[in-house]
Interface confidence: low
């Protein structure tokens, strides 16, 4: 009787079970009652990921300079390409088929993490005694000026955008 | 001045397959990424995909399987192919290009009526 | 898919009017957003691109803004050559995707 349902790495067709190609080769032609299933490798720019039936390799992803896009691992008969960006820009999604300027942290927020290939950066806000007065995708929040340590005193306070203004101290007691 | 001209037939049975040119003067196909779009009867308009510069293409999975987008760097055109066509793709087709993100999507064909119909 | 929704889908308006139109990307689209109008004659012309940079010939009564996802047009002061209907286009990531279109007419 002819089978209903076939085993793991089989597909039925025809009514027999056929062994499906494996990853990295494409179906050439279906097994018959003689002959196993006809598998041949996917081309050098082709791949296929799973266990298949498939009678077209993919085609590798593209990483296109043009959408600032480069190779981080080249892909084989068996993976795809993986992208990732170029210099100071990141991925707009997972799949990375495209690429956006990292974002700068404004003044009062320092860099928490610098952005990578596939990541933005990460900013925060500076906390009391820090500031950063610049827009920088690097710079972290700067501590205050101590100016007791230069024998100064305060005399303009700080803010999270600018640093105390030390001066002499007065002489006159 | 970058101009851009969809052309093709107006008419296409059911289950037969669209193509469409889109002939491009002032500037050449092996630069930027040369687009289709569509827009429906009402409103609604679908991105289909592009070719760009070097060849490579990107169709929006939904139509994936049945979409082709090629080039003619001779002529300076590019083409759109779409397979086994209902009356759900009868709509107005535009070819557009795309070169840098700062500028987006900054020139348009006129677009051109392709009613699916027996 | 990143969807956009967009509001009003028709409104009417006198010459003279301000005019907002609004677009919300369901993910963060990093300002890359297109305002185009389409004329009754069918062609389309780009307004606004990466959010709020005035494209070449563009009269500068319209104008562009974003707040996070949530993007907007305004045209300041609308003139007889402006009622068409707009859409918004993210093309931050693929497939692009349109809004659902503001038709503006005349009241």
């Known amino acids: 009787e002819p089978p209903t349902a076939c085993r793991e790495k089989q597909y039925l067709i025809n009514s027999q079970c056929c062994s499906l190609c494996q990853p990295g080769q494409k179906l050439v032609s279906d097994c018959t009652e003689f002959t196993e299933t006809e598998c041949l490798p996917c081309s050098e720019s082709e791949f296929l990921d799973t266990w298949n039936r498939e009678t077209r390799c993919h085609q590798h992803k593209y990483c296109d300079p043009n959408l600032g896009l480069q190779v981080q691992q080249k892909g084989t008969s068996e993976t795809d390409t993986i992208c990732t960006c170029e210099e100071g820009l990141h991925c707009t999604s997972e799949s990375c088929e495209s690429c956006v300027p990292h974002r700068s942290c404004l003044p009062g927020f320092g860099v928490k993490q610098i952005a990578t290939g596939v990541s933005d950066t990460i900013c925060e806000p500076c906390p009391v005694g820090f500031f950063s007065n610049v827009s920088s995708a690097f710079e972290k929040c700067r501590p205050w000026t101590s100016c007791e340590t230069k024998d100064l005193v305060v005399q303009q306070a700080g803010t999270n955008k600018t640093d105390v203004v030390c001066g002499p101290q007065d002489r006159q007691r | 001045e970058v101009q851009l001209q969809e052309s093709g037939p107006g008419l296409v049975k059911p289950s037969q397959t669209l193509s469409l040119t889109c002939t491009v003067s002032?500037?050449?196909?092996?630069?930027?990424?040369w687009n289709w779009i569509r827009k429906f009867p009402g409103k609604k308009l679908e991105y289909m995909g592009f070719i760009s510069y070097s060849g490579s293409t990107y169709y929006t999975p939904s139509l994936k399987s049945r979409i082709t987008i090629s080039r003619d760097t001779s002529k300076n055109q590019f083409s759109l192919k779409l397979s086994s066509v209902t009356a759900a793709d009868t709509a107005v087709y535009f070819c557009a290009r795309f070169r840098r993100y700062d500028d987006g999507v900054d020139y348009w064909g006129q677009g051109t009526l392709v009613t699916v119909s027996s | 898919d990143i969807q956009m929704t967009q509001s009003p889908s028709a409104m009417s308006a006198s010459v003279g009017d301000r005019v907002t139109i609004t677009c919300r990307a369901s993910?963060?689209?990093?300002?890359?957003l297109s305002w185009i109008q389409q004329k009754p004659g069918g062609t389309i012309k780009r307004l606004i691109n990466?959010?709020?940079t005035l494209a070449s010939g563009v009269p500068s009564r319209f104008s562009g803004s974003r707040s996070g996802t949530e993007f907007t047009l305004t045209i300041s002061s609308l003139q007889p050559e402006d009622f068409a209907d707009y859409y918004c286009l993210q093309y931050s990531s693929y497939p692009w995707t349109f809004g659902g279109g503001t038709k503006l007419e005349i009241k």
């Open positions: 990466a959010a709020s």
């Open positions: 993910h963060e689209i990093s300002g890359y």
């Open positions: 002032g500037d050449s196909v092996s630069s930027g990424y």
